[in-house]
């Protein structure tokens, strides 16, 4: 038999060489081309296991889109036809709670999760007899990577800063079931950087297959939380990185989410984008924002894929994506997942299991409406999945998909066997569908969430609400004391109130300067390399948020450290959530906050507000009767008509849908 090469097993402390057999009703036989369902016999540690696999229908599309760039830097859009793909999920016969994510493209490769152990399997290189290596995931050597630096190691602050333990509080939410009853769908977009592409021999097909494999692994991990991972896009930076990847992980993450907001969202709708990099950050495996999955500006993460296997890498991406989904680190909390360590442990442990804490954190996100974008089942042309009636995803050629026959019994609008609408039905799902009928035009379907948002209405001929728009970034709000930024009026008092309760407000400026000039975990302008950055005086208002008049201590599923700094007869309050340095700190001043006349915070710097590119003269463009929205169209006040608010009408914009119904003007907002 062929012996494994050094490269293939150098990362393993123990492994076995096995020959899996494919099962048919008649006999064991050698493998053959991909089927929708397949079973194998696999040996592991002296035991034979029968595994049953089914093609992961929900993973990939008809119009699987891959973005690349030619030598001139021109964007190329490719739709490779990969309907009959070779990525499977399944279970081990007779093993309770087992799960499998395997590809059967060139031999078997993937993960088997049994009750007490996870195994990796991969084809033995240069074997002509279908031999494979099987190993426990615990036996994979891993560099001690962290999702950032542990804050516990940072020395105590100077004596004049009184660090206070917050008073103990009852949890906001009682312990609930781990798995939410309603399936959530994460529309995931993956971007692969130039160095990783080079590392893969500049082979686009190999990169694509590896990322589909990764998405299949992620799906197998998230399914325990009733979350499905749907890969909606892949971009490979074939011609060079489109962001600056020099600097610390925080800098790169900031650059990536800015690029995503400017260039990617407009091209392909998605809930979270994850950048895959070859370059490491001195022991930091990745970095992501917490609870931002549905955010236009911050729904992203970065993940280091160096000299590790895709199986190990999957737990890093699961971890960073978990942060986007509102999950904090498990460290220091009473968490269990039935394994030595869980996915959201701050050390990149290679775990496959989410903890009870992760389930609770995600539930909090959904209860706080932070996960609204996860409710939509991806549209047929947006999911990388082979179409299949019954997968609860409305695929190309389907009008609805109510799931299993049992689930379809409860659906009055959808014909389960054909995935077509029942004869009397106009629609079966969507915000503008009720009782199998389109809601009338002018029905409010997405209300205004802040003074910087605008409402959207049903158009009367679609089950979907109009796409979400808001007031253009840079429009003045809060009586000219702030600017609109991504649909929110960003100002210090509001940020203090989110953290410290409704009576809190911004601390004096002297306080910001005094605290943020220190460059420690309670006062800084971000993190670079392995240390906190001191704020230059001109940037101090864009560092750690400082508040006064604090009467409540925050509870966000984790207990933060609170710091008070005495200043001129008042106490300035700041907070360190101790999330680890792979997580941008929610105790920092928000991006887009006004930090001076005509200035805003960006990347912890107070810069000219012209970076927002606000270019709307409301008097000229909207005749003084409206504002510009994020598509640069006028949203008119009630009484004036789009597109330019020149003539009498019922308000709204060309983007909002009709704001009234001719049959029933009582519907008007």
């Amino acid at each position: 038999a062929a012996r494994p090469g050094f490269q293939q097993t150098s990362h393993l402390s123990s492994y076995e060489i096995i020959t899996p057999w494919r099962l048919t009703r008649e006999r064991r036989e050698a493998p053959r081309p991909y089927s929708k369902q397949v079973s194998y016999v696999i040996q592991a540690e002296g035991k034979e296991h029968i595994i049953h696999l089914e093609r992961n229908k929900d993973l990939l599309p008809e119009d699987f889109v891959v973005y690349t760039y030619n030598k001139e830097g021109t964007l190329i859009t490719d739709h490779p036809n990969i309907q009959n793909h070779c990525h499977y999920r399944g279970y081990v016969e007779g093993v309770h709670n087992s799960s499998i994510a395997l590809s059967d493209c060139f031999g078997l490769r993937g993960l088997l999760h049994l009750e007490n152990a996870s195994y990796g399997i991969e084809p033995l290189q240069n074997s002509s007899h279908f031999e494979h290596i099987i190993y426990r995931m615990d036996d994979v050597y891993k560099e001690p990577l962290k999702c950032g630096v542990s804050n516990k190691d940072i020395e105590k602050e100077t004596a004049k800063d009184e660090e206070e333990e917050p008073p103990s509080m009852t949890q906001l939410l009682r312990r609930r079931r781990a798995v939410l009853p309603q399936t959530r769908y994460v529309e995931l977009f993956i971007v692969v950087d130039k160095e990783r592409y080079d590392m893969m021999g500049r082979n686009q097909t190999a990169v694509r297959e590896e990322m589909i494999l990764l998405a299949n692994y992620l799906d197998s991990m998230y399914i325990m939380l009733n979350i499905r991972i749907v890969l909606v896009g892949l971009e490979i930076w074939t011609n060079g990185n489109l962001i600056n990847i020099v600097g610390g992980a925080g800098d790169v993450l900031g650059n990536f989410v800015q690029w995503r907001e400017k260039f990617l969202i407009t091209r392909r709708r998605h809930d979270s984008a994850q950048l895959v990099l070859k370059k490491g950050f001195g022991g930091t495996a990745g970095m992501a924002f917490v609870g931002t999955v549905c955010s236009r500006s911050h729904a992203g993460g970065i993940n280091v894929f160096g000299q590790i296997t895709v199986e190990t890498f999957a737990s890093i991406v699961a971890h960073e994506l978990g942060h986007n989904l509102g999950m904090n680190h498990d460290d220091g909390r009473d968490c269990s997942c039935g394994a030595k360590s869980c996915i959201m442990n701050s050390g990149a442990s290679g775990s496959r299991n989410f903890s009870s804490c992760s389930a609770e954190d995600f539930e909090k996100l959904t209860l706080n409406k932070g996960g609204n974008c996860l409710l939509n089942i991806p549209k047929p042309d947006e999911a990388y999945s082979a179409p299949s009636c019954g997968n609860k995803l409305v695929d190309a050629g389907e009008e609805c998909d109510c799931g299993t026959p049992k689930e379809c019994e409860l659906d009055p609008c959808c014909e389960g066997s054909t995935c077509k609408l029942k004869s009397f039905a106009e629609c079966a799902y969507g915000d503008c569908c009720k009782d199998c009928r389109f809601l009338p035009g002018g029905t409010l379907c997405r209300g205004k969430t802040s003074e910087c948002d605008v409402p959207e209405y049903c158009n009367g001929s679609s089950q979907f609400c109009q796409p979400d728009v808001f007031i253009q970034n840079g429009y003045p709000c809060q009586n000219n004391k702030a600017y609109c930024y991504n649909g929110m009026c960003q100002y210090y008092d509001a940020q203090c109130q989110v953290i410290f309760g409704s009576k809190a407000k911004a601390a004096p400026k002297d306080c910001f300067i005094e605290v943020n000039s220190k460059g420690d975990r309670f006062g800084n302008c971000g993190f670079s390399g392995n240390e906190y950055k001191k704020c230059a005086t001109g940037n101090a208002l864009c560092g750690k948020l400082q508040c006064e008049n604090v009467q409540e201590i925050p509870v966000f599923g984790i207990v933060p450290a609170i710091i008070q700094t005495p200043s001129r007869g008042t106490k300035c309050w700041g907070v360190d959530f101790q999330l680890g340095s792979d997580v941008p700190d929610p105790g920092m001043v928000n991006e887009g906050t006004k930090c001076g006349a005509g200035k805003i915070c960006r990347n912890f710097q107070c810069v000219d507000a012209s970076v927002l590119n606000y270019d709307c003269d409301v008097q000229k463009k909207c005749h003084g009767h409206g504002v510009c929205n994020s598509n640069k169209n006028c949203h008119c006040e009630n009484g004036w008509a789009p597109p330019n608010c020149e003539t009498k009408g019922y308000g709204g914009s060309v983007d909002s849908g009709p704001t009234y119904n001719e049959m029933n003007t009582a519907l008007r907002d």
């Epitope: 407000k505 002297d510 006349a597």
Partner: nanobody
Framework: EVHLVESGGGVVQAGGSLRLSCVAS????????LVWFRQAPGKEKEREFV??????????DYTDSVKGRFTISRDNAKNTVYLQMNSLKPEDTAVYYC????????????????????WGKGTLVTVSS
């Protein structure tokens, strides 16, 4: 371009009065806290907070040594801040500087030099005994 220009300084007998003015141009005046500092002779680089007026147009603040003698006021229509100085003492002798500071809290009056965004060139007040 932003300019702060002080005027009204001069020589005055102890017990006398002066009114300093500071005209601002090139900035949205009403968004700023306006502050007077002073620098006594021989105290280079050390400027003492004297009085300030918050951006909210209501709050004022004074250093203890001038309370009851000095009054700060502002006229947003004229983009001007004033410092009325009565019962002047020899120890009030200094170069008086006008400064402007944008603050996150509109009732805030910063007292630290480092919190100021713009400075004037100063006007000299000499109180003789």
């Amino acid at each position: 371009e932003v300019h702060l220009v002080e005027s009204g300084g001069g020589v005055v007998q102890a017990g006398g009065s002066l009114r300093l003015s500071c005209v601002a141009s090139g900035l949205p005046f009403s968004e700023y806290a306006l502050v007077w500092f002073r620098q006594a002779p021989g105290k280079e680089k050390e400027r003492e907070f004297v009085a300030g007026f918050a951006a909210n147009g209501i709050n004022t603040d004074y250093t203890d040594s001038v309370k009851g003698r000095f009054t700060i006021s502002r006229d947003n229509a004229k983009n001007t801040v004033y410092l009325q100085m009565n019962s002047l003492k020899p120890e009030d002798t200094a170069v008086y500087y006008c400064a402007a500071s944008w603050t996150p809290a509109y009732n805030d009056i910063p007292r630290h030099m480092s919190s100021m965004d713009q400075w004037g060139k100063g006007t000299l007040v000499t109180v003789s005994s």
